[in-house]
Amino acid sequence: SAHLHPRDSCPLGPGRCCHLETVQATLEDLGWSDWVLSPRQLQLSMCVGECPHLYRSANTHALIKARLHGLQPDRVPAPCCVPSSYTPVVLMHRTDSGVSLQTYDDLVAQGCHCA
Amino acid sequence: SAHLHPRDSCPLGPGRCCHLETVQATLEDLGWSDWVLSPRQLQLSMCVGECPHLYRSANTHALIKARLHGLQPDRVPAPCCVPSSYTPVVLMHRTDSGVSLQTYDDLVAQGCHCA
């Protein structure tokens, strides 16, 4: 809406608000070691952090949610930090005939917002 | 992935997991009474509830996030309940020249998932 402006500066202090963070995970961590061959270690970008009022609001719904959470915190949850976009990843995995490559478009986050 | 299957039954009990809920809000609640004329009361569908392991996972990223949250709960947050789709709503609002109708495509949630 014209009367609610999302903001990009974190009022909680550095690194506390919704942002992208890299998490190292092995195929064993993911439970994929029986079918994915490579890479054996993945750099997984994930969205972490809090979503204070108006911070990186995804859309009008998120702006409203933030406002109503302030009024009815027990009823309406605060917006939360989720991916706004993804970066594709190619994995090598086992097939009946050997090994093949497959792309995953929704595995690694590229950007985050509060929804 | 072929080895992680999202599920639709809530292990926490009825109404506890991620679902759509209607919240009544007035224009005053939203801080819109100075520029929106109608409707004066909005039925806002919002996504509320928890996202236990594999429940209504939005995509591969959400499945992985749930898995890593189980392994590193302090580092990786659990997936959270956000809109998967929206239903458009028309608002009548003031303009410099009088009154106009405007459609908002991202104001009212229509479906929810865990992202």
Partner: antibody, heavy 119, light 110 residues
């Protein structure tokens, strides 16, 4: 500094075998895939295949399957491309290239190895 | 015949803006990112743009990439003599994995 250094130019006769190399340095060799790309004289780039040097898993382009063999020796951070029986049509520049973090592009390239096959 | 289609050549005068197109399909560019490589005469290709519109460090901001639907384009502004090279787009295709365009020769006039 990331570097891929390839072996020198080769002149061979049809039917002969050949193995060219690509040595990686300045990064963890087993953490990134290595691909091979062919460029015939005056032509464009063609992807031949890829190897994961850590597990030695290989995947070939359908056009090159059965024509070449890709291998790696992680103890000396080197990838290889080999032919058991060369043909005149194998005359080309061959490049090795390292894959970027998520495997969708090539971020570093070797200088190329020119292979000439002529009777 | 390349899976990705590029014009064989483009040209421009120093200081001008030129664009190079790369046309694909729903099985490649339509679903995945496009990358661009520059090959100066007698040298190996070099990564110029990755993931549609990202520049590796060291690549001047005169180079930019974009993607729309099943097509992508590379734009070069403030053309310089040293930009004369072959340019290749590259993506992923579900049937043949990594695919390149046929290449475009950029000539800087004058």
């Amino acid at each position: 500094e990331v570097q891929l250094v390839q072996s020198g130019a080769e002149v061979k006769k049809p039917g002969e075998s050949l193995k060219i190399s690509c040595k990686g340095s300045g990064y963890s060799f087993t953490s990134y895939w290595i691909g091979w790309v062919r460029q015939m004289p005056g032509k464009g780039l063609e992807w031949m295949g890829v190897i994961d040097p850590g597990g030695s898993y290989t995947i070939y382009s359908p056009s090159f399957q059965g024509q070449v063999t890709i291998s790696a020796d992680k103890s000396i951070s080197t990838a290889y491309l080999q032919w058991s029986s060369l043909k005149a049509s194998d005359t080309a520049m061959y490049y090795c290239a390292r894959y970027g973090r998520y495997g969708t592009y090539f971020d570093y390239w070797g200088q190329g190895t020119l292979v000439t096959v002529s009777s | 015949q390349s899976v990705l289609t590029q014009p064989p050549s483009v040209s421009g005068a120093p200081g001008q803006r030129v664009t190079i197109s790369c046309s694909g399909s729903s099985s490649n560019i339509g679903v995945l990112y496009v990358n661009w490589y520059q090959q100066l005469p007698g040298t190996a290709p070099k990564l110029l743009i990755y993931s549609n519109d990202n520049r590796p460090s060291g690549v001047p901001d005169r180079f930019s990439g974009s993607k729309s639907g099943t097509s992508a384009s590379l734009a070069i502004t403030g053309l310089q003599a040293e930009d004369e090279a072959d340019y290749y787009c590259q993506s992923w295709d579900s049937s043949s994995n990594y695919v390149f365009g046929g290449g475009t020769k950029l000539t800087v006039l004058g």
